[in-house]
């Protein structure tokens, strides 16, 4: 799995342990080993949500399986909670796109997962 | 909806009201309320199009519905026009990927839109 | 086609001709003309893979057609090789998401490819 956060929150406001915490929490939530999880946080972005530049985040979670109605609701609760607690971003100013990737469409280590 | 522009145009060349204008224009074009629209502009990028680093842009528009053949052509005309007028990027150096998102695959406010 | 690389490798470690090389290699691999190929490299990113911040990369390749099981394995071999040779990123710390785009969902030059 790969989780990406783009946010207008400044770099200085991203806690040191945030990526580690995301890795562990996503491993637990997806049931995938932490060694397969990639996390990417992009602060200081030029972005607006509802036309204002109050703190906001545009995110994506890509996974081979483990994506679906109930699971995505769980991930959203978890991730919006972390973004609120750690980056002070209001949950109603967060979008998270979920992608259920086909194993043949994910490259890794010189090949694919298919 | 969420509109993202990645471009090699410098930050100083992004007009003050560009994100606001994109928000309003996309609200009108998609028929979705402006309060649901997120805009993200990423200038100063290391990118090439056709092997050259003349001004260019790689964009994406994610929406739950309102994506389709005729609609995408309209969005492309609108967005390429704005990128040309505001950032001076030639329309033949712009790609825009359109994504019709399933409501269950978009997280917001601690849950999803499903 | 559009190839995007996000990496925690610093800007100074991205060779001068890297984007040109990617353009040529992708043109050859996809069988698409170089003038249609866009390349975007984003260095200095705040990212982890397997919970560590050793060099890693999160990539995507979008194309209208030319995406599939065998082709993606070929692209992965090629791209992981280039990322290893040029940016010194271990292939087992690279993910590449492949997207087979519908022509109607790719905007260019004020319209779409449909």
């Amino acid at each position: 799995p790969m989780f990406i956060v783009n946010t207008n929150v400044p770099r200085a406001s991203v806690p040191e342990g945030f990526l580690s915490e995301l890795t562990q929490q996503l491993a637990q939530a997806t049931g995938k080993p932490a060694q397969y999880i990639a996390v990417h946080v992009v602060p200081d972005q030029l972005m607006t949500f509802s036309g204002t530049n109050d703190p906001c985040a545009l995110c994506s979670l890509h996974s081979i399986g483990k994506i679906g109605g109930a699971q995505n609701r769980n991930y959203s609760k978890l991730l919006c909670g972390l973004l609120s607690d750690r980056l002070h971003i209001s949950p109603d100013r967060v979008y998270i796109n979920y992608y259920d990737m086909n194993a043949a469409n994910v490259g890794w280590n010189g090949s694919t997962f298919a | 909806p969420m509109f993202i522009v990645n471009t090699n145009v410098p930050r100083a060349s992004v007009p003050e009201g560009f994100l606001s204008e994109l928000t309003q224009q996309l609200a009108q074009a998609t028929g979705k309320p402006a309060q649901y629209i997120a805009v993200h502009v990423v200038p100063d990028q290391l990118m090439t199009f056709s092997g050259t680093n003349d001004p260019c842009a790689l964009c994406s528009l994610h929406s739950i519905g309102k994506i389709g053949g005729a609609q995408n052509r309209n969005y492309s005309k609108l967005l390429c026009g704005l990128l040309s007028d505001r950032l001076h990027i030639s329309p033949d150096r712009v790609y825009i990927n359109y994504y019709d998102m399933n409501a269950a695959n978009v997280g917001w406010n601690g849950s999803t839109f499903a | 086609p559009m190839f995007i690389v996000n990496t925690n490798v610093p800007r100074a470690s991205v060779p001068e001709g890297f984007l040109s090389e990617l353009t040529q290699q992708l043109a050859q691999a996809t069988g698409k003309p170089a003038q249609y190929i866009a390349v975007h490299v984003v260095p200095d990113q705040l990212m982890t893979f397997s919970g560590t911040n050793d060099p890693c990369a999160l990539c995507s390749l979008h194309s209208i057609g030319k995406i599939g099981g065998a082709q993606n394995r070929n692209y992965s071999k090629l791209l992981c090789g280039l990322l290893s040779d040029r940016l010194h990123i271990s292939p087992d710390r690279v993910y590449i998401n492949y997207y087979d785009m519908n022509a109607a969902n790719v905007g260019w030059n004020g319209s779409t490819f449909a």
Epitope: P15, G17, F18, P55, L87, H88 | - | -
Partner: antibody
Framework: EVKLEESGGGLVQPGGSMKLSCAAS????????MYWVRQSPEKGLEWVAE??????????YYAESVKGRFTISRDDSKSSVYLQMSSLRAEDTGIYYC?????????????WGAGTTVTVSS | DIQMTQSPASLSASVGETVTITCRAS??????LTWFQQKQGKSPQLLVY???TLAEGVPSSFSGSGSGTQFSLKIISLQPEHFGSYYC?????????FGGGTKLEIK
Amino acid sequence: EVKLEESGGGLVQPGGSMKLSCAASGFTFGDAWMYWVRQSPEKGLEWVAEIRSKAHNHATYYAESVKGRFTISRDDSKSSVYLQMSSLRAEDTGIYYCTSHHYGSSWYFDVWGAGTTVTVSS
Amino acid sequence: DIQMTQSPASLSASVGETVTITCRASENIYSYLTWFQQKQGKSPQLLVYDAKTLAEGVPSSFSGSGSGTQFSLKIISLQPEHFGSYYCQHHYGRPYTFGGGTKLEIK
């Protein structure tokens, strides 16, 4: 200058009530998350309550030891945060500090008031 | 609740010496740890956040390290103004607990 100033402390009998106030200045109070922390020789420093900003619906959280007895609130127009304490016990005795971390700074307790002393005794 | 165990509880040292105070969390708190200094009769002052980042205006004689469950605060070349009490605190999740404190006294 960033400043927090507590008031309202004093002597109160067990079972009684008391309301503490904290006036903030020098930063955008509306964006700040505000906290009460107390200190006593017996228990040391102890987080008591938290109230988030309007953008976070003024969400409130409490230490288990005060839940149901204490209420944190805020008035953004007055740049003030309050702690209403009821059913007070001897173990609530201590110095009560108002503290905050505000948007744009680190997200830690980087601003503290001088404290106000609460004594619960008969 | 996460327990924060600080050691030593008290410490005597001379001006110019180097001292290290440690803090152990009862579970993984990543780097969500802060250190405070408190002088007699005053409120706590933030010294270090994110386990190792010095707060604004804090001299480089202070340094924080650690992650997970083991953390330390090092003070080199002790000065008279460094004497007082030091506390660690986690903010990984509520309740945000503090260590019991370390009283640093002049020998």
